[in-house]
């Protein structure tokens, strides 16, 4: 009897999550009579995985038919492996006893490691938009992978970034791990069409890394530049003044015309034109009836972009001093000033 050995030939087995694990075990003798049990872990807290004698183990099947004579193969197959199944498994021979069977001999153990794919990286940017020349932070998270070794890279429009910090948790042994990385990105006016990419490489991905993306269009705000110009007289006593709103993003924009500080008209940008870089241009015009004014007129184009404090640009219309007679020409000169 003392000659019986329990052989677990595989020191370690690595299995992809979702697959089956085969844990091999053979006895070298039919003696003593008694069942085999499989445990995960050793000592008093060990977890019963399979008991030949009794119990219900829906995920476990024996590789060979234990009822067949001369059977000494006690290998098991565990189905639908998850990272929680990782650990060292022991094949233990019990000797028939009365009333209870007695542990006789254990195998050396097989360490089961589970290869689990990382989840798709999720990239998130700042809660509020930022303007060019500002530095913003992006985070990338991926979870549930095993083993712990993982590589994370950041790219902006295909160019690798270097200013980032990455942590893999937990630090100690675990059934699975998570990665968290924060990258700093300096915005430019051309970034409306830009993308930030977080790329995760892991042994389970067979050289085909997972990517998470964030569009800088969700993050950037490009404030408009304003230009107010006076057009040639369209009709007697009327001057056409335009406000060119250029290179802004996002589109949300409200423009108000003021005549000598009084609101003349408010409108919302609608039929904008898009520039190659993704920013927008818009133009608003105002017809000013010069004959209605005795004094010079200060016209102001005031723009509120994306909920930010208004910016404005003013234009002075000089009204001639001579009396206004019907049909007479009115000279109007302009001087421009920027107000914010």
């Amino acid at each position: 009897e003392e000659g019986l050995q329990v052989i677990q030939p595989d020191k370690s087995v690595s299995v992809a999550a979702g697959e089956s694990a085969i844990l091999h075990c053979t006895a070298t003798s039919l003696i003593p009579v008694g069942p085999i049990q499989w445990f995960r872990g050793a000592g008093p807290g060990r977890e019963l995985i399979y008991n030949q004698k009794e119990g219900h183990f829906p995920r476990v099947t024996t590789v060979s038919d234990l009822t067949k004579r001369n059977n000494m193969d006690f290998s098991i197959r565990i189905g639908n492996i998850t990272p929680a199944d990782a650990g060292t498994y022991y094949c233990v021979k019990f000797r028939k006893g009365s009333p209870d069977d007695v542990e006789f001999k254990s195998g050396a153990g097989t360490e089961l490691s589970v290869r689990a794919k990382p989840s798709a990286p999720v990239v998130s940017g700042p809660a509020a938009r930022a303007t060019p020349q500002h530095t913003v932070s992006f985070t990338c998270e991926s979870h549930g992978f095993s083993p712990r070794d993982i590589t994370l890279k950041w790219f902006k429009n295909g160019n690798e970034l270097s200013d980032f910090q990455t942590n893999v948790d937990p630090v100690g042994e675990s059934v699975s791990y998570s990665i968290h990385s924060t990258a700093k990105v300096v915005l430019t006016r051309e970034d409306v069409h830009s993308q930030v990419i977080c790329e995760v490489a892991h042994v389970t991905l067979q050289g085909d890394p997972l990517r998470g993306t964030a569009n800088l269009s969700e993050t950037i705000r490009v404030p408009p530049t304003l230009e107010v110009t006076q057009q040639p007289v369209r009709a007697e006593n009327q001057v056409n003044v335009t406000c060119q709103v250029r290179k802004f993003y996002p589109q949300r924009l409200q423009l108000t015309w003021l005549e000598n500080g009084n609101v003349s008209r408010t409108e919302t940008a609608s039929t904008v034109t898009e520039n190659k870089d993704g920013t927008y241009n818009w133009m608003s015009w105002l017809l000013v009836n010069v004959s209605a004014h005795r004094d010079d007129v200060k016209l102001t184009c005031q723009v509120e972009h994306d909920g930010q404090p208004a910016v404005s640009k003013s234009h002075d219309l000089k009204v001639s001093a001579h009396p206004k007679e019907q049909g007479s020409n009115t000279a109007a000169e302009n001087t421009g000033s920027n107000e914010r």
């Epitope: 009579v33 008694g34 030949q52 004698k53 009794e54 009822t67 004579r69 001369n70 028939k96």
Partner: antibody, heavy 119, light 110 residues
């Protein structure tokens, strides 16, 4: 603890059939063979047949091959032995026994069922 | 078929003395490195009880005064010092092929 509980005594007429049951507990029924053995009054042990409840594989003693049928009901962990065309010399205690080592041996026994065949 | 023949048919031994029961197979019961012989004890009104398996291995809870030996075709069950509770009929059984039993040996106290 392994237990094999057999059905009660039967009295049958010659030519009739008898079906003896053996309800197993304390172990996984499908993992071990069940043997059937009989013992006529004052006589020795005679092996009848064996069944593997996991797949209903059976082996019969040639003497009983045409008259005995072994079956199992895994939902109730019960083994059955039916013997047909009974004769007076079939009067015996019928035992079920479980083979704990897959050695074609009999480790745990039921208490037996007395079948009396008499006209 | 392999036939097992036990000898003697009955045996009377004094308490504390050695009892020896023999079992001869009509052909070798050795296979795969094992001798496929089993010994059972049956007391009146009780089912048999396994004593020895694979010729020489005591079953769980069997007193060590019981021992089995032999190989091939000739096997022996020995009770080194007979006790009163050992009075019973003893059977050998083989499973080299499908099982068969010997005819039994009745052991009594002299």
């Amino acid at each position: 603890q392994v237990q094999l509980v057999q059905s009660g005594a039967e009295v049958k007429k010659p030519g009739a059939s008898v079906k003896v049951s053996c309800k197993a507990s304390g172990y996984t029924f499908t993992n071990y063979w069940i043997n059937w053995v009989r013992q006529a009054p004052g006589q020795g042990l005679e092996w009848i047949a064996m069944i593997d409840p996991s797949d209903s594989e059976t082996h019969y003693n040639q003497i009983f091959k045409d008259r005995a049928t072994l079956t199992t009901d895994t939902s109730t962990s019960t083994a059955y032995m039916e013997l047909r065309s009974l004769r007076s010399d079939d009067t015996a205690v019928y035992y079920c026994a479980m083979d704990y080592g897959s050695l074609y041996a009999m480790d745990y026994w039921g208490r037996g069922t007395l079948v009396t065949v008499s006209s | 078929d392999i036939v097992l023949t036990q000898s003697p048919d009955s045996l009377a031994v004094s308490l504390g003395e050695r009892a020896t029961i023999n079992c001869r197979a009509s052909q070798s019961v050795r296979s795969s490195g094992y001798n496929w012989i089993f010994w059972y004890q049956q007391k009146p009104g009780q089912p048999p009880k396994l004593l020895i398996y694979l010729a020489s291995n005591r079953d769980s809870g069997v007193p060590d005064r019981f021992s089995g030996s032999g190989s091939g075709t000739d096997f022996t069950l020995t009770i080194s010092s007979l006790q009163a509770e050992d009075v019973a009929v003893y059977y050998c059984q083989h499973s080299r092929e499908l099982p068969t039993f010997g005819q039994g040996t009745k052991l009594e106290i002299k």
